[in-house]
Interface confidence: low
């Protein structure tokens, strides 16, 4: 399908480059459309003059943040997966709510709530959710420590989900954990209110459970406290899922190719 | 590209499965040998008659359950991992070692050492091991079990590495934790034996910390005691590393194309 | 996916996963590799229509992009998705040995 | 491996990522993205040269097989082995939407 | 104002070498894609190709071996190399800038120069 | 490569008729389709592109329509100014650039 052109690319039947970059164009304008599903480019006539909100541009760099992180693995991708994913976030629930009131005195753990009627909002049916990721900005950190992540489970207990082992920094540092299971969950429930705490790691032997680490959003030296929140930099999920009118138009055309 | 053909693959140049199929073959007994950087099929003159002996039929079954429990995705593959792995295993020091008497009383845990001049003889250099896996057989379990993984670090500290829900279970089944960190470092430095713990899951609230789960080489309800090792089937470290006289010729060619 | 599961028991005509079973002593006149005997290799085929050009009417091929040109490619090409390895038995001199041979074994395909 | 790091910086003629920046304004007409304004798409090109055959001489083509033909494939095929996502903002009427498109950007190249 | 003014043209030996000139002036010439369009006497339009504002070119396949075409963004200009030339590629040489509508922004030719008269004759 | 045929290569008519140019793409390219019109001196100027969107500026009497291989441009009622060779252009993409080789509308 080639021919040559001056000093590029030498092949069994030589390259033309520029035909190959302008046909990856062509393939990358319909792979933007059909991942979205849209026919044709949305009309931009009701676009509000001016900048993008801040909240959908801090959204945005969040999902930069973690695609910036993330392994360049290539995974296998189910049909659900190829198509775009619209990224909502939910912050955790202000600590003035009752619900923290219970657990104000311990000193390995910190407790972070969500609403799951916002939860809902974002994601109205579970199916939808690809993926879920708790979102912490964990402040500097003098010495190495071991933290796990517990979802609240019944009355009084908790679940293990993961562990993190934290290097000492002097940055800022947002922490993710996948919580794709447990937001499932929970949309499939019928809670008001659920949450994660975050634990020192206690062995067997030893004794000392503090929690070191500082996660924008509780007080410095009062995690039991749990004061004052800073803003949309407290504790948040990070939800990616099929918007439910795509995923709809997906059920119906169920047939292969 | 492609045109129609009966009912075969539809193709531009309708395919001639036979041809694939046969380029396929011819391609395989290239990879297999050029993986083994084998010029040509090994001399069979020196093979002793009669059949495989046990060790090594064990080794390659543990090798291919491996395989069967191994998620199928297509990993980025160095130049290094795509050449074959020799596999190797090193079974557990034998518990009358006098290495066993300090760690006899604990409940919640128990020990695993291993020969550091055995593993050196399987991989003489850290560098050319590409997997080390520890092996432990779980016998049937009643209940879900939280297990802990530590290394041996210093005199008598202990190095979180990585953690298992165990659900219940009627038969026997194996565990694999991924140690190749663990394993190079231990072959890097001088000591003469190295370990493991598996532990209950202690969290910083409970006090249950019975290790339920018993280990195939571990007396049932005497851990403390250390007692009797069944077999083969003791815990092991299985080995994959780039035999020393493949890593050479690799390193000699280390030139790109 | 265009995996063992759906490719071995339909008659697809597109890009997916074909059988292959090599014989070392049939397949390769081998009679060095004594376990396994054979393995099934499999190998993938079928074109990835480019189903994207500026006269094809947008709606109508959206359903069909993801498995027919997913990565966007100027020419999608049908191969491995997911491997498995292979270990196998042999003998160096008198010396029995047991090696791991990564990515041997096709277990899906796709259009890349 | 055939990333951008050695791809970029060097004159591999054989299969390699290539780079391509997006600006989707000027390369595709579009002024319905807003954010980003453009992306590192890249992509693979450069040929898989077969190298094994009854009639090549085992030794010398050892060497070059696991890079020209890695997977065994009846007829290798330069393409992406490492992906990564792209993150756009775009308006659905007045409703400002952030999006994730999987496997958009091409960090690494195989022959498969 | 907006402009494009080609310059280079004249007459020249059939196997010889060309460089033609086009400068713009106006707008953003750093943004735009450009083209190179030329006509023979009496005849009709030929497309020889574009460069976007990366300096990847397109061209036509006939243009491919002995045209070459090139930007210089700082100076704002563009630049098409003729080599070998030969009798048939006598024609006046247009440079054109792309529109800027969605979906049809390369090819469709928006703001023309007066184009340069290239004669090839021994 | 798209070959353009373009028909007639000539015609003659007088101001006010109603004037009707055809062009044929050999293979389909949409509605990726231009018209130009070119007077003796001067680069041509672009009339309607997206076989039937007219170009700003450009009056209502021209239109253009069609898509895949055929297109017509339709001058409804001629004007004094609009004696000049049209040509049509495809532009599906850049193997696709191709011109026709032009109408000439002359006076009657």
């Known amino acids: 399908d080639y021919k040559d052109d001056d000093d590029k690319l030498s092949t069994s039947k030589t390259i033309d480059m520029e035909l190959v970059k302008r046909k990856r164009i062509e393939a990358i304008r319909g792979q933007i459309l059909s991942k979205l599903r849209l026919a044709s480019p949305p009309s931009q006539g009701e676009v509000p003059p001016g900048p993008l909100p801040e909240a959908v541009l801090a959204l945005y760099n969040s999902t930069r943040d973690r695609v910036a992180g993330e392994s360049a693995e290539p995974e296998p991708e189910p049909e659900a997966d190829y198509y775009a994913k619209e990224v909502t976030r939910v912050l955790m629930v202000e600590t003035h709510n009752e619900i923290y009131d219970k657990f104000k005195q311990s000193t390995h753990s910190i407790y972070m709530f969500f609403n799951t009627s916002e939860l809902r909002e974002a994601v109205p049916e579970p199916v939808l959710l690809s993926r879920a990721e708790l979102r912490l900005l964990r402040l500097k950190l003098k010495v190495e420590q071991h933290v796990e992540l517990y979802q609240k489970y019944s009355n009084n207990s908790w679940r293990y989900l993961s562990n993190r082992l934290l290097a000492p920094s002097d940055s800022p540092e947002w922490l993710s954990f996948d919580v794709t299971g447990v937001v499932r969950q929970w949309l499939s429930r019928g809670g008001e209110i659920e949450g994660f705490r975050l634990s020192a790691h206690c062995s067997c032997d030893s004794r000392d459970n503090t929690l070191q680490v500082d996660i924008n959003g509780f007080t410095t030296g009062r995690r039991g406290d749990l004061a004052t929140i800073h803003g949309m930099n407290r504790p948040f999920l990070l939800l990616m899922a099929t918007p439910l009118e795509r995923a709809q138009h997906l059920q119906s055309s169920r047939h292969r190719r | 590209d492609y045109k129609d053909d009966d009912d075969k693959l539809s193709t531009s140049k309708t395919i001639d499965m036979e041809l694939v199929k046969r380029k396929r073959i011819e391609a395989i007994r290239g990879q297999i040998l050029s993986k083994l950087r084998l010029a040509s099929p090994p001399s069979q003159g020196e093979v002793p008659p009669g059949p495989l002996p046990e060790a090594v039929l064990a080794l390659y079954n543990s090798t291919r359950d491996r395989v069967a429990g191994e998620s199928a995705e297509p990993e980025p593959e160095p130049e290094a991992d795509y050449y074959a792995k020799e596999v190797t295993r090193v079974l557990m020091v034998e518990t009358h070692n006098e290495i066993y008497d300090k760690f006899k009383q604990s409940t919640h845990s128990i020990y695993m050492f291993f020969n550091t001049s055995e593993l050196r003889e399987a991989v003489p250099e850290p560098v050319l091991l590409s997997r080390a896996e520890l092996r432990l057989l779980r016998l049937k379990l009643k209940v879900e079990q939280h297990v802990e993984l530590y290394q041996k670090y210093s005199n008598n500290s202990w190095r979180y590495l990585s953690n298992r829900l165990l659900a219940p279970s009627d038969s026997p089944e194996w565990l694999s934790f991924d140690v190749t960190g663990v394993v190079r470092q231990w072959l890097s430095r001088g000591g003469e034996i190295e370990g493991f713990r598996l532990s209950a899951h202690c969290s910083c609230d409970s006090r249950d910390n019975t290790l339920q789960v018993d280990i195939n080489g571990f007396t049932t309800g005497r851990r403390g005691d250390l007692a009797t090792i069944h077999g083969m089937n003791r815990p092991f470290l299985l080995l994959m590393a780039t035999p020393l006289e493949r890593a050479q010729h690799l390193q000699s060619s280390r030139h790109r194309r | 996916a265009l995996d063992t599961n759906y490719c071995f028991s339909s008659t697809e005509k597109n890009c997916c996963v074909r059988q292959l079973y090599i014989d070392f002593r049939k397949d390769l006149g081998w009679k060095w590799i004594h376990e396994p005997k054979g393995y099934h290799a499999n190998f993938c085929l079928g074109p990835c229509p480019y189903i994207w050009s500026l006269d094809t009417q947008y709606s109508k091929v959206l359903a069909l992009y993801n498995q027919h040109n997913p990565g966007a490619s100027a020419a999608p090409c049908c191969v491995p998705q997911a491997l498995e390895p292979l270990p196998i038995v042999y003998y160096v001199g008198r010396k029995p040995k047991v090696e791991q041979l990564s990515n041997m074994i096709v277990r899906s395909c796709k259009c890349s | 491996a055939l990333d951008t790091n050695y791809c970029f910086s060097s004159t591999e003629k054989n299969c390699c990522v290539r780079q391509l920046y997006i600006d989707f304004r000027k390369d595709l007409g579009w002024k319905w993205i807003h954010e980003p304004k453009g992306y590192h798409a890249n992509f693979c090109l450069g040929p898989c040269p077969y190298i094994w055959s009854l009639d090549t001489q085992y030794s010398k083509v050892l060497a070059l097989y696991n890079q020209h033909n890695p997977g065994a494939s009846a007829a290798p095929c330069c393409v992406p082995q490492a992906l990564e996502p792209l993150p756009i903002v775009y308006y659905v009427g007045r409703k400002p939407k952030v999006e994730q498109l999987s496997n958009m950007i091409v960090r690494s190249c195989k022959c498969s | 104002q907006v402009q494009l003014v080609e310059s280079g043209g004249g007459v020249v030996q059939p196997g010889r070498s060309l460089r033609l000139s086009c400068a713009a002036s106006g707008f953003t010439f750093s943004s735009e894609a450009m083209n190179w369009i030329r006509q023979p006497p009496g005849k009709g339009l030929e497309w020889i190709g574009y460069i976007y504002t990366s300096g990847t070119t397109y061209r036509a396949n006939w243009a491919r071996g002995r045209f070459t075409i090139s930007r210089d963004n700082s100076k704002n200009t563009l630049y098409l190399q003729m080599n070998s030339l030969r009798a048939e590629d006598t024609a006046v040489y247009y440079c054109a800038r792309g529109t800027h509508i969605y979906d049809h922004y390369y090819w469709v030719h928006h703001l023309w120069g007066q184009g340069t008269l290239v004669t090839v004759s021994s | 490569d798209i070959q353009m045929t373009q028909s007639p290569s000539s015609l003659s008519a007088s101001v006010g008729d109603r004037v009707t140019i055809t062009c044929q793409a050999s293979?389909?390219?949409?509605?990726?389709l231009a018209w130009y019109q070119q007077k003796p001196g001067q680069p041509p100027k672009l009339l309607i592109y997206a076989a039937s969107t007219l170009e700003s500026g450009v009056p209502s009497r021209f239109s253009g329509s069609g898509s895949g291989t055929d297109f017509t441009l339709t001058i409804s009622s001629l004007q004094p100014e609009d004696f000049a060779t049209y040509y049509c252009q495809s532009y599906s993409d850049g193997d696709s650039v191709g011109f026709g080789q032009g109408t000439k509308v002359e006076i009657k």
């Open positions: 293979q389909s390219i949409s509605t990726y």
